[in-house]
């Protein structure tokens, strides 16, 4: 891997759990300043594999609110606006990192957690098999 | 918002930056144990709006490797396997949290950062406008 030269101004790391436990500044830096705020706001409705967004809230998690996509149909919308069941609407999933309060209900102590979220849906052509 | 009763076993929070700076255990808990390992492995190729995955590596970030989707075509693949330019392949984007080493090159001090990643692509019907 890449060796990172250590900055002499780093905070002290004499914690017995180091490097498993680190200090994290929650003052979020947002790198998305130039992104279009509308970026995918209507794709969920206009896609050939449209989806609904469901709010998932958990006060023990940071961020506490995550939006989950659920495909509206099994099939995809064709040129006539009908569902074509020979195609599949499938969720595009991504593993993301969240912070889980640990011990529970603690305001300043967390553990990293990996969760799988459905971000949206895409239309795929299945390979058809005929079985005995 | 929801008030969380404080756990008396919480770590000390006398830090002058509290609650902006918190302790985070990097020993990741993975909640995805029951997910299908094949889940979206070939959707990128079989979608009507296929995409390529590009590796984005940054040793100052955690996770250091993030995969970015780039749609292969402007249009979508039709039933004949040709690109239909009356439809649009568009990226589905999601804001995710990552940890940025701060100060730089420090192994045990981070700041939360929000970045926008393209997870995959979907096919949308554009709204057509004819202008003078």
């Amino acid at each position: 891997g890449i060796t990172i030269p250590r900055n002499p101004g780093c905070p002290n790391s004499e914690d017995k759990n180091f490097p498993r436990t680190v200090m994290v500044n929650l003052n979020i830096h947002n790198r998305n300043t130039n992104t279009n705020p509308k970026r995918s706001s209507d794709y969920y409705n206009r896609s050939t594999s449209p989806w609904n967004l469901h709010r998932n809230e958990d006060p023990e998690r940071y961020p506490s609110v995550i939006w989950e996509a659920k495909c509206r149909h099994l099939g995809c919308i064709n040129a006539d606006g009908n569902v074509d069941y020979h195609m599949n609407s499938v969720p595009i999933q991504q593993e993301i990192l969240v912070l889980r309060r640990e011990p529970p209900h603690c305001p300043n102590s967390f553990r990293l957690e990996k969760i799988l979220v459905s971000v949206g849906c895409t239309c795929v052509t299945p390979i058809v098999h005929h079985v005995a | 918002g929801i008030t969380i009763p404080r756990n008396p076993g919480c770590p000390n929070s006398e830090d002058k930056n509290f609650p902006r700076t918190v302790m985070v255990n990097l020993n990741i808990h993975n909640r995805n144990t029951n997910t299908n390992p094949k889940r979206s492995s070939d959707y990128y190729n079989r979608s009507t709006s296929p995409w390529n995955l590009h590796r984005n590596e940054d040793p100052e970030r955690y996770p250091s490797v993030i995969w970015e989707a780039k749609c292969r075509h402007l249009g979508c693949i039709n039933a004949d396997g040709n690109v239909d330019y009356h439809m649009n392949s568009v990226p589905i984007q999601q804001e995710i949290l990552v940890l940025r080493r701060e100060p730089p090159h420090c192994p045990n001090s981070f700041r939360l950062e929000k970045i926008l990643v393209s997870v995959g692509c979907t096919c949308v019907t554009p709204i057509v406008h004819h202008v003078a």
Partner: nanobody
């Protein structure tokens, strides 16, 4: 490999009922959704009903909605299609299917004939 075996087809009078079963075995952990298609004589295959594995949502083709009901028994690895108020237009070979998103598996089919 996936195995699908349909049963329950047969001859029925218009207005009658039938219940189709599909026994599923093999590598089914990849399931996204499963259900039934049908192919009327001399026509293409059309969607009848489906059930999404992740949340149990059910979906129906326009021509059967309100008359047919899809259900499943996880313990028995069996999929069912309860067909009520049958019409001559429902005459077809009914195929059970299982779908991973990327791959779709169809069984051999069972014939349903509805006489007027």
């Amino acid at each position: 490999q996936v195995q699908l075996v349909e049963s329950g087809g047969g001859f029925v009078q218009a207005g009658g009922s039938l219940k189709l079963s599909c026994s599923v075995s093999g590598n089914t952990f990849i399931t996204n959704h499963m259900g039934w298609f049908r192919q009327p004589p001399g026509k293409g295959r059309e969607f009848v009903a489906g059930i999404r594995w992740s949340d149990g949502s059910t979906f129906y083709g326009d021509s059967v909605r309100g008359r047919f009901t899809i259900s499943g028994d996880n313990a028995k690895h069996t999929l069912y299609l309860q067909m009520n108020s049958l019409k001559p237009d429902d005459t077809a070979v009914y195929y059970c299917y299982i779908d991973s998103g990327s791959d779709r598996y169809y069984g051999q089919g069972t014939l349903v004939t509805v006489s007027s």
